[in-house]
């Protein structure tokens, strides 16, 4: 069974600046990754990034950086500042498309007892939905 | 079958603005950016910027900024680009397109004299 | 911003000729995670919107005659037409889709000879 694994960090250098990475477990081939927080796609949380493996990236503040880390994995950097930057429970969500398994999502957010610069490692988390 | 279906074109004078709208169908219309390109007569392709209709996030070309605006109606599928302070230079066909560029509408003819 | 430029400004090919269509950027377009070129090329007819041909830097958008192909990698890219036809007449644009801003060439005008 595929799996989706999110990884929340908050940076040491900068407090308020997050880096998300996201994976995948399964075979088939990446077609979509949707990152978004303040819970799932399309189910009240906000799009902060959408990864295409060919066409492109497309990502919006307070999305900094958003890049490919390997075929089946994406990191995103957030920036920290303003009204809609992160707090330390903000629910961050992955979700990825693939064939020919469906999709796949799983939501994270930073371990409570982390200190800055430390995560917990990347296991998979919790499969909240799988749209088949 | 996607399709992106902009509003007609339209005459301006120096200083006024142009709001046009670009009906989206045969897909998740929040779940893809809007883009906005315009081209004038003559001349190559340049992205003015792209707004998420889902939660109306939005990214602008620096040269833009502080003239356009995007924003988006969920409930209808359509998106919406409107430039002010218009000067001659902004006479130019105004693209909407979706999918990483996949799509296009037909083009919007904005022309601005006095 | 990333400078797209590409050569020759225009072009003149006969019919069943191969054309060829070179597309430089300022910075390096390969994303080196999942090594994949984020440059896309685009055929504009008079009067139409521009067409998605290529994207990817080599993946053929759907519908689009293999006669069409696209290489190239890192900051150099090609777009070639194996036998020119005259439904080919356009002008054609390559596009950084690495990073923001989206920055298109300047365009490249084919002709028949």
């Known amino acids: 069974t595929p799996e989706v694994w999110v990884q929340v960090r908050m940076e040491a250098t900068e407090l308020s600046s997050f880096t998300i990475r996201c994976g995948f477990l399964g075979s088939g081939s990446i077609s979509l990754v949707t990152v978004s927080w303040g819970g799932p796609n399309g189910a009240g949380g906000t799009t902060l990034a959408v990864l295409h493996p060919e066409r492109g990236i497309r990502q919006w503040a307070p999305a900094r950086q958003a890049r490919w880390e390997t075929q089946s994995s994406i990191s995103l950097i957030l920036e920290g500042s303003g009204a809609s930057s992160p707090c330390a429970n903000t629910t961050f969500c992955c979700k990825f498309a693939s064939f020919p398994e469906g999709s796949w999502e799983a939501c994270g957010s930073l371990p409570p007892s982390s200190d800055p610069g430390l995560s917990a490692p990347p296991t998979p988390a919790p499969i909240l939905r799988a749209d088949l | 079958e996607v399709q992106l279906v902009q509003s007609g074109a339209e005459v301006k004078k120096p200083g006024s603005s142009v709001k046009v709208s670009c009906k989206a169908s045969?897909?998740?219309?929040?779940?893809?950016?809007i883009e906005w390109v315009r081209q004038a007569p003559g001349q190559g392709l340049e992205w003015m910027g792209e707004?998420?209709?889902?939660?109306?996030?939005?990214n602008y070309n620096e040269k833009f900024k502080g003239r356009v605006t995007f924003t988006a109606d969920e409930s209808t599928s359509t998106a919406y680009m409107e430039l002010s302070s218009l000067r001659s230079e902004d006479t130019a066909v105004y693209y909407c397109?979706?999918?990483?560029?996949?799509?296009w509408g037909q083009g919007t003819l904005v022309t601005v004299s006095s | 911003d990333i400078v797209m430029t590409q050569s020759p400004d225009s072009l003149a090919v006969s019919l069943g000729e191969r054309a060829t269509i070179n597309c430089k950027s300022s910075?390096?377009?390969?994303?080196?995670?999942?090594?994949?070129?984020?440059l896309a090329w685009y055929q504009q007819k008079p009067g139409q919107p521009p067409k998605l041909l290529i994207y990817?830097?080599?993946t053929r958008e759907s519908g689009v005659p293999d006669r069409f192909s696209g290489s190239g990698s890192g900051t150099d890219f090609t777009l070639t037409i194996s036998s020119l036809q005259a439904e080919d007449v356009a002008v054609y644009y390559c596009?950084?889709?690495?990073?923001?801003?989206?920055?298109f060439g300047q365009g490249t005008k084919l002709e028949i000879k």
């Open positions: 397109s979706s999918y990483w560029f996949a799509y």
């Open positions: 045969g897909y998740t219309f929040s779940s893809f950016s």
């Open positions: 707004i998420l209709p889902g939660s109306n996030s939005t």
């Open positions: 910075q390096s377009l390969l994303n080196s995670g999942n090594q994949k070129n984020y």
């Open positions: 990817g830097a080599s």
């Open positions: 596009q950084n889709a690495h990073s923001y801003p989206p920055t």
